[in-house]
């Protein structure tokens, strides 16, 4: 029989929107044919108000940190590490996760991942669909309607349920993220919401929901009173840097 | 208009060939994940395939893998479904239907005869 | 797959009289995101499905008032408050939480 995509599962992944970008949809655990899902983070934190975070891998740092020595390249060199902030494009680099979100290790340099851009093809005057609430509206099939003045289309930004392309379509603190098989706008995510942090950067499995990102100045981290559990019930939430 | 429009139904032997279209309008596409639902004669609805809204993720009903393919052209606003092997059993209208937002076309009829 | 189970798969109503149709789900369709993806349309002979009730209790635009959804979980309900002779068709529920999306065996409303 059909390997069932669990919709309703707490444990299906949640995977954020790429940088400037796509998004998510539901599932039971299933057998789909490979996908590329995206890599999300946070903003990139500045220098001024970062404060180190100590780590022992990278899992416990956030989607754009890695888990390092302060004065060596590797993680797991002898010393202290905590989290550093991720190696933009072009930068060099010793494994995948030292790279920023939407890129990848390559011959020691961060490389853009193929499925980092929007695809072609997308629609440039887009229009946003609420979700939500205008399955009754009067115009049309209750579907979406066009505000238009002098024959020019103006968009309004797409409140939490509407369907997207990107995270620029919707709404502040709104994120494009998948949902089932379409994306819609969902919340970025606020200090001490459960946030999806990947153990390896382009090896994920189909992720049918995906959460936004982490706010501004917040990153995904391991929860403290988690570090002892077993590695796969660990809780990562967003945290202050 | 918001609407899905199905061609590409006919009658077609067992073992041939046949690629349905869905015309989509009025609304963001590429947005959207799509599927395609049958109805056999006298029957209930029967769940297809689906695509993603970038066309990466397809998933399948046991009763078309391998033979069914559901693809998408967002620049065309286009869905389709290319079905191979085709079998007496694969005969119904066949629907495209728009997830979330529920939304269904009018249907397209595959007869599979000899 | 979710198994969709519809009671009673036959209904005749006098015009004006309520009709209530049930439809329970294998599991709940309640997901996550605080939705339930439960649906309900009516199919007419030759036609597509017409789609009434959306997430268990919305109706679409255009659909009468006399309709209306209620339920959560895995017990739902469709209620006609007053039966019209258009109404006649067969009922189905629907759940697309999961793949594949399954439907009830259907619920014919006749006349009497």
């Known amino acids: 029989t059909l390997n069932s995509v669990l919709i309703n599962s707490n444990a299906i992944k949640n995977l954020p929107p790429p940088l400037g970008g796509a998004g998510g949809q539901p599932g039971s655990a299933v057998s789909v044919a490979p996908g590329v899902l995206y890599e999300g983070g946070n903003k990139y934190q500045t220098l001024d108000n970062y404060q180190p975070y100590p780590c022992a891998e990278d899992e416990e740092c956030g989607s754009d940190e890695y888990c390092s020595s302060p004065s060596r390249g590797a993680a797991g060199v002898g010393g202290v590490q905590i989290c550093l902030a991720c190696r933009k494009r072009r930068k060099r680099c010793m494994r995948h996760a030292m790279c920023c979100p939407g890129n990848y290790c390559k011959n020691g340099i961060c490389m853009p991942s193929d499925h980092s851009h929007f695809p072609r093809g997308e629609i440039e005057e887009s229009i946003i669909e609420n979700l939500g609430n205008d399955h009754n509206a009067a115009a049309g099939d209750g579907y979406p309607r066009r505000t238009t003045l002098t024959s020019k289309i103006y968009h309004t930004k797409g409140q939490e349920g509407s369907v997207c392309l990107r995270s620029s379509d919707c709404a502040a603190g709104l994120c494009c993220a998948r949902h089932f098989w379409s994306k819609i706008c969902k919340p970025v995510l606020k200090e001490g919401q459960v946030c999806t942090k990947h153990k390896r950067k382009g090896s994920h499995g189909l992720e049918i929901f995906q959460r936004c990102y982490c706010g501004e100045g917040l990153a995904c981290r391991i929860q403290k009173d988690h570090h002892q559990a077993s590695n796969s019930s660990r809780l990562h939430t967003c945290q202050r840097h | 208009q918001v609407q899905l429009v199905e061609s590409g139904g006919g009658v077609v032997q067992p073992g041939r060939s046949l690629r349905l279209s869905c015309a989509a309008s009025?609304?963001?596409?590429?947005?959207?994940?799509m599927h395609w639902v049958r109805q056999a004669p006298g029957k209930g609805l029967e769940w297809v395939a689906v695509i993603s809204y970038d066309g990466n993720d397809k998933y399948y009903a046991d009763s078309v893998k391998g033979r069914f393919t559901i693809s998408r052209d967002n620049a065309k606003n286009t869905l389709y479904l290319q079905m191979n092997s085709l079998r007496a059993e694969d005969t119904a209208v066949y629907y495209c239907?728009?997830?979330?937002?529920?939304?269904w076309g009018q249907g397209t009829l595959v007869t599979v005869s000899s | 797959d979710i198994v969709m189970t519809q009671t009673p798969l036959s209904l005749s109503v006098t015009p004006g009289q309520p009709a209530s149709i049930s439809c329970k789900s294998g599991?709940?369709?309640?997901?996550?995101?605080?939705?339930?993806?439960l649906y309900w349309y009516l199919q007419k002979p030759g036609q597509p499905p017409q789609f009434l009730i959306y997430?268990?209790?919305n109706r679409f635009s255009r659909v009468p008032d006399r309709f209306s959804g209620s339920g959560s979980g895995t017990d739902f309900t469709l209620k006609i408050s007053r039966v019209e002779a258009e109404d006649v068709g067969i009922y189905y529920c629907?759940?697309?939480?999961?793949?594949?999306?399954?439907f009830g065996q259907g619920t014919q409303v006749e006349i009497k």
């Open positions: 239907a728009r997830e979330l937002r529920v939304l």
């Open positions: 599991q709940s369709l309640l997901h996550n995101d605080g939705k339930t993806y």
């Open positions: 629907m759940q697309s939480i999961q793949l594949p999306w399954t």
């Open positions: 009025g609304f963001t596409f590429s947005g959207y994940g």
């Open positions: 997430e268990v209790s």
